[in-house]
Interface confidence: medium
C-alpha cells in the first residue's frame, strides 16, 4: 500500500469549483496507478443557526483560507495584543523558524493521526462512478427554499436544524496530481481527501487519506431573493409581507432586512432567520393609513444580496378582516 499523498492544497476559482493539487507519496511501494479524490460538504457551525442576528450587533467575519467563520461584536473595538513590549493594536509577533517547524510537524501529526483513526487502509469501491453532486445538493438543501417542486423524498431531515453528516463523493484521477471538483455549493466548506493507489489497489486497497478543507467562493446573485414579494392585509393597521428565500445561498441566510415607507423607504425592520423559518415572511405593525413601498434584502454568510424590486401595498383607515396570522 502506498503512503499518503503529500502537500495537499486546495483553492477555489469559482463559486462551484475547487482546484486540488498534491504531490505523489514518498513511498509508492510499487507502480503508482491513480488517486482517489473524495469530498464532503461540511455542516455549518450550530451557532450560526441558533444565533438571532437581529438581536445584537453581531456580524460574521469571513475567513476564506481555513473555512472558519467567527462572530464579532460590531460595537467592540478590536482586541489589542501585547507585541514586542508595546501596547496597542498590532499584528502578531513573527514566528521563529523553530516555532514554524514545530507547528508544521504538529499539524502533520494531527492529520496523520486522524487519518489513522479514520481510515487506515482505503479500499476503493469497484466500478464506482462519480455521482452527480447536485442530486444530493438538491436532496439536502433546505426544503423551504424550493418554490417549484417539493423534495424528492420524505426521509430527509432539514439541514437547517441539525449538523448533518453529508455524504462523500469520489472520483478517480489518473496520471496527474491535480483535479477540479465541480458542481459544489457557493461559499460552502468542503473536506477533500486524497488517497494514493498503486498496482495492488484492488487486492490490498489504497493509502489512508491526506486531506484539506477549502471553501468555495461566493456566487454573485446567490443571495438575491427570487420571485415576487407578496403582501396580505392584517387587522389593526398591519400587513404581512411574504417572500421566497434564496434557493442556493452563499452558506446560509442569517437574516433579512425590510426597508419600507410611504413617501420614502425610511423605516427598517430586521427579520431573524428564526422568524422567517416560522412564518416565511414578516408582519409590519402600526402603519398609518396610506400607500407604501417595501424592499427586502437577504444577508448571508458572505454578505448582502440585492434589494428586491419594490412591492406596493396600502393600509386602509379601518380594516375588518378575520383574525390573521401573528
Amino acid at each position: 500500500v502506498p503512503s499518503i499523498p503529500l502537500d495537499v492544497l486546495s483553492a477555489s476559482n469559482s463559486s462551484s469549483q475547487l482546484i486540488v493539487k498534491w504531490n505523489p507519496p514518498s513511498l509508492p511501494n510499487g507502480n503508482l496507478s491513480y488517486y482517489i479524490v473524495r469530498w464532503q460538504r461540511q455542516p455549518q457551525d450550530g451557532y450560526l443557526y441558533r444565533h438571532n442576528y437581529c438581536s445584537k450587533d453581531k456580524i460574521p467575519i469571513r475567513k476564506y483560507a481555513d473555512g472558519t467563520i467567527d462572530i464579532e461584536e460590531v460595537t467592540e473595538n478590536p482586541k489589542t495584543e501585547v507585541c514586542g513590549g508595546e501596547k496597542g493594536p498590532c499584528c502578531a509577533c513573527p514566528k521563529t523558524e523553530a516555532e514554524k517547524q514545530a507547528e508544521k510537524e504538529e499539524a502533520e501529526y494531527r492529520k496523520v493521526f486522524e487519518n489513522f483513526l479514520h481510515n487506515s487502509i482505503f479500499v476503493p469501491r469497484p466500478e464506482r462512478k462519480r455521482r452527480d453532486v447536485m442530486q444530493v445538493a438538491n436532496t439536502t438543501m433546505s426544503s423551504r427554499s424550493r418554490n417549484t417542486t417539493a423534495a424528492d423524498t420524505y426521509n430527509i431531515t432539514d439541514p437547517e436544524e441539525l449538523e448533518t453528516e453529508y455524504p462523500f463523493f469520489e472520483s478517480r484521477v489518473d496520471n496527474k496530481e491535480r483535479t477540479v471538483i465541480s458542481n459544489l455549493r457557493p461559499f460552502t466548506l468542503y473536506r477533500i481527501d486524497i488517497h494514493s493507489c498503486n498496482h495492488e489497489a484492488e487486492k490490498l486497497g489504497c493509502s489512508a487519506s491526506n486531506f484539506v478543507f477549502a471553501r468555495t467562493m461566493p456566487a454573485e446573485g446567490a443571495d438575491d431573493i427570487p420571485g415576487p414579494v407578496t403582501w396580505e392585509p392584517r387587522p389593526e393597521n398591519s400587513i404581512f409581507l411574504k417572500w421566497p428565500e434564496p434557493e442556493n445561498p452563499n452558506g446560509l441566510i442569517l437574516m433579512y432586512e425590510i426597508k419600507y415607507g410611504s413617501q420614502v423607504e425610511d423605516q427598517r425592520e430586521c427579520v431573524s432567520r428564526q422568524e422567517y423559518r416560522k412564518y416565511g415572511g414578516a408582519k409590519l405593525n402600526r402603519l398609518n393609513p396610506g400607500n407604501y413601498t417595501a424592499r427586502i434584502q437577504a444577508t448571508s454568510l458572505s454578505g448582502n444580496g440585492s434589494w428586491t424590486d419594490p412591492v406596493f401595498f396600502y393600509v386602509q383607515a379601518k380594516t375588518g378582516y378575520e383574525n390573521f396570522i401573528h
Epitope: 426544503s143 420524505y154 430527509i156 431531515t157 436544524e161 441539525l162 396580505e232 416560522k278 378575520e322 396570522i325
Partner: antibody, heavy 122, light 107 residues
Framework: QVQLVESGAEVKKPGESLKISCKGS????????IGWVRQMPGKGLEWMGI????????RYSPSFQGQVTISADRSITTAYLQWSSLKASDTAMYYC???????????????WGQGTTVTVSS | AIQLTQSPSSLSASVGDRVTITCRAS??????VAWYQQKPDKGPKLLIF???TLQSGVPSRFSGSGSGTDFTLTISSLQPEDFATYYC?????????FGGGTKVEIK
C-alpha cells in the same frame, strides 16, 4: 423516514375527557407547524387548528375554538388534541398533519398521520 | 370568514378523460391554495400546493392553476387510480378552510 404516528382508536361516553396524540419522527419536530383535521363519517375534511411546537403558537378554526385544546411536547416530539367534555357529535376520524416538505403552514399539509377514530356513544 | 366553494360536488368520468375541478374563494387569497386526493378509508394526500406547485411523487397529469379567488385542479388524462374525492384548501389567514370536496366516480 419522516412520519406522524397517531394513538389508537378510542371509544368514550359523552361528558368524558380525552387526549389523543401524534408523534413526529424523522424531522425537526419543533420547527414545523403541525395541525389537526376532523372527518366525520361520510363527510368532508374540517381544519381544526395548528401549532408551532417551538413556541407553542397555536391557531384554531372559529368552529373549534373553545371546543378542543391543541398542545405539543417538544421533548417527546408529540402533538396532542384534547377534549374536556366529549359529545356524540365529536365522533369522527381525526388526522394530524404537518407542513414539512412544503415548509410553511399556508402551503398545505404534506405529511399525514394514519388517523385516530374517536367514537362517542352512551 | 373566507368561504371556499368547490364545484362540482361530484362528477362521472371515464378513463382518459380530462377532468377539471374548480375552487372559488369569497375574497383574494393570493396563491395559498392546496389540493388533496383522498381515497376511501385512507388519509388525504397532498397533490398541489401554492396553487400550482406539484408535490413530489405526484404524476404530472395533475396540475393546478389560478390566483386570487379562482383556482382549478386539472387531471389531463384520468387513470383508474384517480377515482377518489378531491379537496381544495385555502391557507392565508389564522385558520384554514377546506372546500366541500369533489367525488370523481367512474362513468
Amino acid at each position: 423516514q419522516v412520519q406522524l404516528v397517531e394513538s389508537g382508536a378510542e371509544v368514550k361516553k359523552p361528558g368524558e375527557s380525552l387526549k389523543i396524540s401524534c408523534k413526529g419522527s424523522g424531522y425537526s419536530f419543533s420547527n414545523y407547524w403541525i395541525g389537526w383535521v376532523r372527518q366525520m363519517p361520510g363527510k368532508g375534511l374540517e381544519w381544526m387548528g395548528i401549532i408551532y411546537p417551538d413556541d407553542s403558537d397555536t391557531r384554531y378554526s372559529p368552529s373549534f375554538q373553545g371546543q378542543v385544546t391543541i398542545s405539543a411536547d417538544r421533548s417527546i416530539t408529540t402533538a396532542y388534541l384534547q377534549w374536556s367534555s366529549l359529545k356524540a357529535s365529536d365522533t369522527a376520524m381525526y388526522y394530524c398533519a404537518a407542513s414539512i416538505v412544503t415548509g410553511y403552514y399556508y402551503y398545505g399539509l404534506d405529511v399525514w398521520g394514519q388517523g385516530t377514530t374517536v367514537t362517542v356513544s352512551s | 370568514a373566507i368561504q371556499l366553494t368547490q364545484s362540482p360536488s361530484s362528477l362521472s368520468a371515464s378513463v382518459g378523460d380530462r377532468v377539471t375541478i374548480t375552487c372559488r374563494a369569497s375574497q383574494d387569497i393570493s396563491n395559498y391554495v392546496a389540493w388533496y386526493q383522498q381515497k376511501p378509508d385512507k388519509g388525504p394526500k397532498l397533490l398541489i400546493f401554492a396553487a400550482s406547485t406539484l408535490q413530489s411523487g405526484v404524476p404530472s397529469r395533475f396540475s393546478g392553476s389560478g390566483s386570487g379567488t379562482d383556482f382549478t385542479l386539472t387531471i389531463s388524462s384520468l387513470q383508474p387510480e384517480d377515482f377518489a374525492t378531491y379537496y381544495c384548501q385555502k391557507y392565508n389567514s389564522d385558520y384554514s378552510t377546506f372546500g366541500g370536496g369533489t367525488k370523481v366516480e367512474i362513468k
